[in-house]
């Protein structure tokens, strides 16, 4: 799978994580920081 950094317009897309662009899947993906989950890393869990 080809990946690259997200475009600048997606700054802030991932609330608590790193935004990755999955080129072949035509979508952005959030790699969440430890303790966070959700499509956009918007949920905190213990």
């Amino acid at each position: 799978v080809s990946i690259t950094k997200c475009n600048s317009d997606m700054n802030g897309y991932c609330l608590h994580g790193q935004c990755i662009y999955l080129v072949d899947m035509s979508q952005n993906y959030c790699r969440c920081e430890v303790g966070y989950t959700g499509v956009r890393c918007e949920h905190f869990y213990l």
Epitope: T4, N7, S8, S26, Q27, V39
Partner: antibody, heavy 116, light 106 residues
Amino acid sequence: QDQLVQSGAEVKKPGASVKVSCKASGFNIKDTYIQWVRQAPGQGLEWMGRIDPLRGNTKYREKFEGRVTITADTSTNTAYMELSSLRSEDTAVYYCVRSGTLFDFWGQGTLVTVSS
Amino acid sequence: RIQMTQSPSSLSASVGDRVTITCKASQDIHKYIAWYQQKPGQAPRLLIQYTSTLQPGVPSRFSGSGSGTDYTFTISSLQPEDIATYYCLQYDNLRTFGGGTKVEIK
């Protein structure tokens, strides 16, 4: 199956406002950005602005600043585009477009006609 | 705001011809360019995103290339069903469409 279903065609008088809705099904709009694009008859595609429904943040093209308002109601999974002070040049098909989790998934379009 | 200059605005070519459309951005858009096909009365159809990534179901005669500010869209062998208007879109920083290229059969 993911869908963006837009409200029906509208006819408005110059100076009036129009509010177009875009209801999502099959996915949560909070996971996406919703863009709005318009196309006047026989003309090209024109980006108007977008909303991040999760945060409520909006960005607008400069030429529409002050005249367009994009909102989202996450409880009904619906985005809206309101354009005020309509003039004949605003006659166009208005599209909502999902981006973020999937690159550019389009609604069917809503024809807005401005005529006295 | 990033400007996208698309050329030519229209072209006429024969079936089987190679067709090339270019888009020039006013600043580096880091390969974040997409290409759409639009036929009369229809919504735009995404053909290519991220400069060269073909969408599922799109024929391999369509291709894209470029980097920095200069990008190219190519139809290697024009078919009658390719008659349409084509648009580039930069999506690096907000969004801007090119002016479109109307492709006709000679």
